[in-house]
């Protein structure tokens, strides 16, 4: 099963630096909505990794919208003062990693993952579907990346980012990968896999931005997000080619990206099971 389906494209298979997000909605594009008001709001820009101003129309839009710069930073940036994370220093875990597992009060019984501060590991638990707290992850991988320590006692996420003074672009700094990468693909490629809320078990693929590969997951049939593809090829075509590898010697290999991306159409209604 070749990971490539297009000629003349060079993509290295080394582990890619993750663009870590505290919340998946931080990866959404700024959405001014269909209304015509002029309201100053802030959104998190995944390409500059900074909170920026935009004009909101006053209705609809998405969750990547904040009343203030401070609120945006609080929700979407991990360390506002120092954007470079040294691997020799343990990166601080978010406070919510230390909250105990909380099923919430509803009765949905959805499998989720939480960081157990006693065992220092991410573990499975049953979430009811509403309320609870933020120590609640849809995938084990997401939980580990945010809350677990690596094998040497450091955070798993030990990549930093640094603003490049030459062209104001972001270049991730990594101890694992000698070359540098930038992500120029669709923002939904950075969101976690989302099963949705229905009962089906459809085979789908999502792009795992932590390891830079398309991985299978089970889709419930409704809800979820746009990081959801019917085939691995389609997933790779939409997401993997968004990475540009900067070669150490200054060369640049730009991967081809087709303009049109066929994506799975997702129905955003929810089907709730009676007596949930």
């Amino acid at each position: 099963d070749s990971e490539e389906d297009e000629e003349h494209t060079i993509i290295t298979d080394t582990e890619l630096p993750p663009l870590k997000l505290m919340h998946s909605f931080c990866a959404f594009k700024a959405d001014d909505g269909p209304c015509k008001a002029i309201m100053k709001r802030f959104f998190f820009n995944i390409f500059t990794r900074q909170c920026e101003e935009f004009i909101y129309g006053g209705c609809e839009g998405n969750q990547n919208r904040f009343e203030s710069l401070e609120e945006c930073k609080k929700m979407c940036t991990r360390d506002n003062a120092n954007r470079i994370i040294k691997t020799t220093l343990q990166q601080e875990k978010p406070d919510f990693c230390f909250l105990e597992e909380d099923p919430g009060i509803c009765r949905g019984y959805i499998t989720r993952y939480f960081y157990n501060n006693q065992t220092k590991q991410c573990e499975r638990f049953k979430y009811g579907g509403c309320l609870g707290n933020m120590n609640n992850f849809e995938t084990l991988e997401e939980c580990k990346n945010i809350c677990e320590d690596g094998p040497n006692g450091f955070q798993v996420d030990n990549y930093g980012t640094q603003l490049n003074a030459v062209n104001n672009s972001l270049t991730p700094q990594s101890t694992k990968v000698p070359s540098l990468f930038e992500f120029h693909g669709p923002s939904w490629c950075l969101t976690p896999a989302d099963r949705g809320l229905c009962r089906a078990n459809e085979n789908r693929f999502y792009y795992n931005s932590v390891i830079g590969k398309c991985r299978p997951f089970k889709y419930s049939g409704c809800g979820g997000n746009e990081n959801n593809f019917t085939s691995k090829q389609e997933c790779l075509r939409a997401c993997k080619k968004g990475f540009i590898q900067r070669i150490s010697k200054g060369g640049l290999i730009k991967t081809k990206r087709k303009r049109k991306k066929q994506r799975v159409k997702i129905a955003y209604e929810e089907i709730f099971v009676k007596n949930m």
Partner: antibody
Framework: QVQLQQSGPGLVKPSQTLSLTCAIS??????????WGWIRQSPGRGLEWLGM?????????DYAVSVKSRITINPDTSKNQFSLQLNSVTPEDTAVYYC???????????WGQGTLVTVSS | DIQMTQSPSSLSASVGDRVTITCRAS??????LAWYQQKPGKAPKLLIY???NLQSGVPSRFSGSGSGTDFTLTISSLQPEDFAVYYC?????????FGQGTKVEIK
């Protein structure tokens, strides 16, 4: 039919502790499918959620940030009731306090009759 | 916290009128929304839960719709006993929050 009966003083002095109790009939405070909470209502602030407790193999609580440092909600399984304690009250805490039951799908389906608590010296 | 914004804050209507109250959440709350009716000196009374489900014993003239961020409570034919304050309430995320209320008055 679930019923919630509130009791407690209507007048509390500033800096003291507000204590209210909610007695449950028709359900159990230890139910694995319900939750129990307190809400208050004042003219200036509308309906304000204060916190809840619930039992799912062990006890959990969830408190509003605005009162987190001062609030305790405790179950009393022997009397099938739960209580609210709010420490260091000020006149700002003057409100009608309600206890409520949360159903297994999250909404509040039964409410106590309400207790007007005035904080004044 | 999720902000719940109700509109209008008050309205005047006559018996028999069709009344619509809207509630907007500051972010998606899926279908975790309830509507309550409150009369002076009384506790709120549950009308609608999970956005569109009618609570047992509530007259069928009350109905709810919506999901995500925009929700509506409709009273198809206003009755004298319906004059009250109506609140929406989200229970998707903690802390649970309420709208500021809509007062339905007699015209």
């Amino acid at each position: 039919q679930v019923q919630l009966q509130q009791s407690g003083p209507g007048l509390v002095k500033p800096s003291q502790t507000l204590s209210l109790t909610c007695a449950i009939s028709g359900d159990s405070v230890s139910s694995n499918s319900a939750a129990w909470g307190w809400i208050r209502q004042s003219p200036g602030r509308g309906l304000e959620w204060l916190g809840m407790i619930y039992h799912r193999s062990k006890w959990y609580n969830d408190y509003a940030v605005s009162v987190k440092s001062r609030i305790t909600i405790n179950p009393d399984t022997s009397k099938n009731q739960f209580s609210l304690q709010l420490n260091s009250v000020t006149p700002e805490d003057t409100a009608v306090y309600y206890c409520a039951r949360y159903s297994s799908i999250g909404h509040m389906d039964y409410w106590g009759q309400g207790t007007l608590v005035t904080v004044s010296s | 916290d999720i902000q719940m914004t109700q509109s209008p804050s008050s309205l005047s209507a006559s018996v028999g009128d069709r009344v619509t109250i809207t509630c907007r959440a500051s972010q998606s709350i899926r279908s975790y929304l309830a509507w309550y009716q409150q009369k002076p000196g009384k506790a709120p009374k549950l009308l609608i839960y999970k956005a569109s489900n009618l609570q047992s014993g509530v007259p069928s003239r009350f109905s709810g719709s919506g999901s995500g961020t925009d929700f509506t409570l409709t009273i198809s034919s206003l009755q004298p006993e319906d004059f009250a304050v109506y609140y929406c309430h989200q229970y998707s995320d903690s802390p649970v929050t309420f709208g500021q209320g809509t007062k339905v008055e007699i015209k």
